[in-house]
């Protein structure tokens, strides 16, 4: 399977891990679908709910991804990018704050630009209810991480703020930052940041990056 | 800097067909965004014709569908307007044009300075 | 096809000025709107995209806002050079399409 909308497709509309494969290639990678959300088929791309996995990561280590599907991760960069530059993806980011709120922000076009283009992010077509303007820079940025400054900004955002991300200098949002537990989460330039929902210093309780071919 | 330079016929007959040439130079075509052609009519009315992406895909505007192909020339960064079965309200300055955005219509960050085509006999 | 309504068509105003533009779409075009300059004997440069960012090394003078249905571009203080036809263009579905132009004319 590709995607997870391909594995849907397939009659699996259980929510899980399963095998995808690289377009074009043999490579494998596990990832976990979300087979009940807004119609099922969901690729997760990157959660984060709990602190269990540091986010502060090596440009290798974000290119082919860590963590566990079942739980935090990140799922890679490399796949990401070759996945969306097949046919034309949707990017659901579904964020929750610490009051019990739930929000989300549905860009109708991504795509990740190849790792030659430093995995630049590609966002079109903002709808949902965490902001009328997007927390990612528009138009995207390249990918930075702590052994890859790719930001527009003399400070090194991936090191200050921590985490990868596209960063711009350093931008309004940043979902791979440190974990705040309840209480400790407020005031936080380096957490998980969404500005157009919760403001600048509003480090998240979860966070959820999903993809789907648009014409699923 | 990204560099775009449109070239072709100024006069072209109707019924013929308008063939226009974008030559870009200091980015690759096939590295990334999509390569446009714009056109702009006596009057200042603009008109988005197409694209070809970086991956040699294309989208024409309804309008023009059945008229329009734009291809590419990677070798010499270079892609291509072909419009058949002219009229002279295809009389227009043609652009080329880089859009902000790979896959999909978008803003267009860098223009050619246009050609001039005339339809008339 | 997304229309885009823009005025007003003709804009007369002296230096210093502030001149407000606006465009409004027949349906949503979410953030997906830009703004464009065309001085005379040139080709249109991109002032404002994603309806409110400012292009690389567009003056801060430059502004833009909206989001779905009504668009706004601003010249805070208008200058001799500024002057020019104006264009909005969306982009959020295809075929883009553009407004018909504000002419700007410095009295």
């Known amino acids: 399977f590709r995607d997870c909308a391909e594995v849907f497709k397939s009659g699996h509309t259980t929510n899980g891990i399963y095998t995808l494969t690289f377009p074009n290639s043999t490579e494998e990678i596990k990832a976990y679908c979300d087979m009940e959300a807004g119609g099922g088929g969901w690729t997760i791309i990157q959660r984060r709910e709990d602190g269990s996995v540091d986010f502060q990561r090596t440009w290798k280590e974000y290119k082919v991804g860590f963590g566990n599907p079942s739980g935090e991760y990140w799922l890679g960069n490399e796949f990401v990018s070759q996945l969306t530059n097949q046919q034309r993806y949707v990017l659901k980011i579904h964020l929750k704050d610490w009051e019990g709120n739930e929000a989300y922000s549905l860009y109708e076009h991504f795509y990740l630009s190849s790792e030659e283009l430093n995995y630049r992010i590609h966002l079109k077509g903002l709808t949902g209810t965490a902001g009328k303007i997007s927390s990612i820079s528009q138009p995207g940025n390249d990918f930075s991480t702590k052994d890859g400054d790719n930001d527009k900004c003399i400070c090194k955002c991936s090191q200050m703020l921590t985490g990868g991300w596209w960063f711009d200098a350093c931008g309004p949002s940043n979902l791979n930052g440190m974990y705040y537990p309840q209480r400790q989460n407020t005031a936080k330039f380096n957490g998980i940041k969404w500005y157009y929902w919760k403001g600048s210093g509003y480090s998240l309780k979860a966070t959820t990056m999903m993809i789907r071919p648009a014409d699923f | 800097d990204v560099q775009l330079q449109e070239s072709g016929p100024g006069l072209v007959k109707p019924s013929q067909s308008l063939s226009l040439t974008c030559t870009v130079t200091?980015?690759?075509?096939?590295?990334?965004?999509?390569w446009n052609w714009i056109r702009q009519f006596p009057g200042n009315k603009l008109e988005w014709m197409g694209y070809?992406?970086?991956?040699?895909?294309?989208s024409y505007n309804p309008s023009l569908k059945s008229r329009i192909s734009i291809t590419r020339d990677t070798s010499k960064n270079q892609f291509f307007l072909q419009l058949n079965s002219v009229t002279p309200e295809d009389t227009a300055t043609y652009y080329c044009?880089?859009?902000?955005?790979?896959?999909?219509?978008?803003?267009?960050?860098?223009w050619g300075q246009g050609t001039s085509v005339t339809v008339s006999s | 096809s997304i229309v885009m309504t823009q005025t007003p068509k003709l804009l007369l105003v002296s230096a210093g000025d502030r001149v407000t533009i606006t465009c409004k779409a027949s349906?949503?075009?979410?953030?997906?709107v830009a703004w464009y300059q065309q001085k005379p004997g040139q080709s249109p440069k991109l002032l404002i995209y994603?309806?409110?960012n400012r292009y690389t090394g567009v003056p801060d003078r430059f502004t833009g806002s909206g989001y779905g249905t009504d668009f706004t571009f601003a010249i805070s203080t208008v200058q001799a050079e500024d002057l020019a036809i104006y264009f909005c263009?969306?982009?959020?579905?295809?075929?883009?399409?553009f407004g018909g132009g504000t002419k700007l004319e410095i009295k």
């Open positions: 044009a880089r859009s902000t955005f790979g896959h999909y219509v978008s803003s267009m960050d860098y």
């Open positions: 200091g980015y690759s075509i096939t590295s990334d965004y999509a």
């Open positions: 070809i992406s970086y991956s040699g895909s294309t």
């Open positions: 349906q949503s075009a979410s953030n997906d």
């Open positions: 994603y309806a409110s």
């Open positions: 263009q969306q982009d959020y579905s295809s075929p883009p399409t």
